[in-house]
Interface confidence: low
């Protein structure tokens, strides 16, 4: 799996999970989240050569097409596969609210 | 929806469906498929600015992050959303076989 266990241990140009810490205030301009101040969102990036963690038959076809037609603009892309939620604390007036924001943290990647 | 009805009618730099015809023999080196000789596979490409057809909360966060941090390499990517199968005819010896290959045709795109 193209997850932290594999990707953070290896120097990998191909599609892999990349570390990314996001500070809510500085990076997103969000001032409404009280806790946490930021989180490890991570992101997916890298090339998608033939059969590198292809998600669908179409992405396999596209990567093979790209191998045979390297001048083409069509190629698969490295995107998130498994995502996890993030629990946040914010206030409505003086009332604290705890909420779970779904699909906030990328755990693994795929070529799609 | 970022489908043919919208994308093939508009000049669109952002994430959209792009036409792509694949010839099995020429483009993939596949000689085993008897019919069809090729098909309209299509592909997804284009930029993913903030809120442009974002797939998940993470992709929305990433596109906003990319807007505020334009020098960053972290950004969502334009990938396939809805896919359709393709029916093919091939031979095992002299016996014709009809099979449906799943997820072969891209019908719409998303930023993920």
């Amino acid at each position: 799996a193209l997850d932290a266990a594999y990707c953070f241990r290896n120097v990998q140009d191909n599609c892999c999970l990349r570390p990314l810490y996001i500070d809510f205030k500085r990076d997103l301009g969000w001032k409404w989240i009280h806790e946490p101040k930021g989180y490890n969102a991570n992101f997916c990036a890298g090339a998608c050569p033939y059969l590198w963690s292809s998600d669908t038959q179409h992405s396999r076809v596209l990567s093979l097409y790209n191998t045979i037609n390297p001048e083409a603009s069509a190629s698969p892309c490295c995107v998130s596969q498994d995502l996890e939620p993030l629990t946040i604390l914010y206030y409505i007036g003086k009332t604290p609210k705890i909420e779970q924001l779904s699909n906030m943290i990328v755990k693994s990647c795929k070529c799609s | 929806a970022l489908d043919a009805a919208y994308c093939f009618r508009n000049v669109q730099d952002n994430c959209c469906l792009r036409p792509l015809y694949i010839d099995f023999k020429r483009d993939l080196g596949w000689k085993w498929i008897h019919e069809p000789k090729g098909y309209n596979a299509n592909f997804c490409a284009g930029a993913c600015p903030y809120l442009w057809s974002s797939d998940t909360q993470h992709s929305r966060v990433l596109s906003l992050y990319n807007t505020i941090n334009p020098e960053a390499s972290a950004s969502p990517c334009c990938v396939s959303q809805d896919l359709e199968p393709l029916t093919i005819l091939y031979y095992i010896g002299k016996t014709p076989k009809i099979e449906q290959l799943s997820n072969m045709i891209v019908k719409s795109c998303k930023c993920s």
């Epitope: 090339a47 998608c48 190629s75 490295c78 | 730099d13 930029a47 600015p49 950004s75 334009c78 990938v79």
Partner: antibody, heavy 125, light 112 residues
């Protein structure tokens, strides 16, 4: 036929600004990345930057800040805005299309084809 | 940032000679093969000869060939023709570098 043609070159004083245009035909700017490359008289080629099919611009470290690449897909044109020009910016400026555009931000084929004929920019007082 | 060093910077040769030009990169090019070769004649834009280190561009004579991987690359002209007298440049594509591309300094091939 796929073509690129640069325009907008000429004589400009040091400290001045200039905007070059690259008119493309035969292909869509929505599907291909276009680069700017320059060549000082009698010297080698120097990559300036590119604008991707999706509209993201990347620059050589020396060009960041003074040079800006943009495009108007409806007009089939790519632009290079050059500010605070210096004598050492005197060069022929070429636009060149990528042969390949991938969806990943990690690399490309370094294959530029086709090229425009170039436009000469002279920075002198 | 990556630097490409070409050698020799100039050479004199006769029609029919075998000519070899080398290009050395200070860091590995992307995918070990994102290296191109260009030919340029006075007053003209460069012409793409070879991409992907060894793939000949359509219409380029077979006397041109490219080889190498990672950091060391070679352009060979097996039998020099009158129209081959020109300046040759290598260009590399890089991952994780602030400069995505770099050109070599050029090699001028002159008539002996």
């Amino acid at each position: 036929e796929q073509q690129l043609v640069e325009s907008g070159g000429g004589l400009v004083q040091p400290g001045g600004s200039l905007r070059l245009s690259c008119a493309v035909s035969g292909f869509s700017l929505s599907s291909y990345t276009v680069n700017w490359v320059r060549q000082a008289p009698g010297k080698g080629l120097e990559w300036i930057g590119y604008i991707s099919y999706g509209g993201s611009a990347y620059y050589a470290s020396w060009a960041n800040g003074r040079f800006t690449i943009s495009k108007d897909s409806a007009k089939n044109s790519v632009y290079l805005q050059m500010n605070s020009l210096r004598a050492e910016d005197t060069a022929v400026y070429f636009c060149a299309r990528h042969m390949q555009v991938g969806g990943a931000p990690t690399g490309s084929m370094a294959a530029f084809d086709p090229w425009g004929p170039g436009t000469l920019v002279t920075v002198s007082s | 940032d990556a630097q490409l060093t070409q050698s020799p910077s100039s050479l004199s040769a006769s029609v029919g000679d075998r000519v070899t030009i080398t290009c050395q990169s200070s860091q590995s090019v992307y995918n070990n093969n994102y290296l191109s070769w260009f030919q340029q004649k006075p007053g003209k834009p460069p012409k793409l000869l070879i991409y992907g280190a060894s793939t000949l561009t359509s219409g380029v004579p077979s006397r041109f060939s490219g080889s190498g991987s990672g950091t060391d690359f070679t352009l060979t002209i097996s039998s020099l023709q009158p129209e081959d007298f020109a300046t040759y440049y290598c260009a590399g594509g890089y991952s994780g570098s602030s400069d995505k591309y770099a050109f070599g300094g050029g090699t001028k091939v002159e008539i002996k």
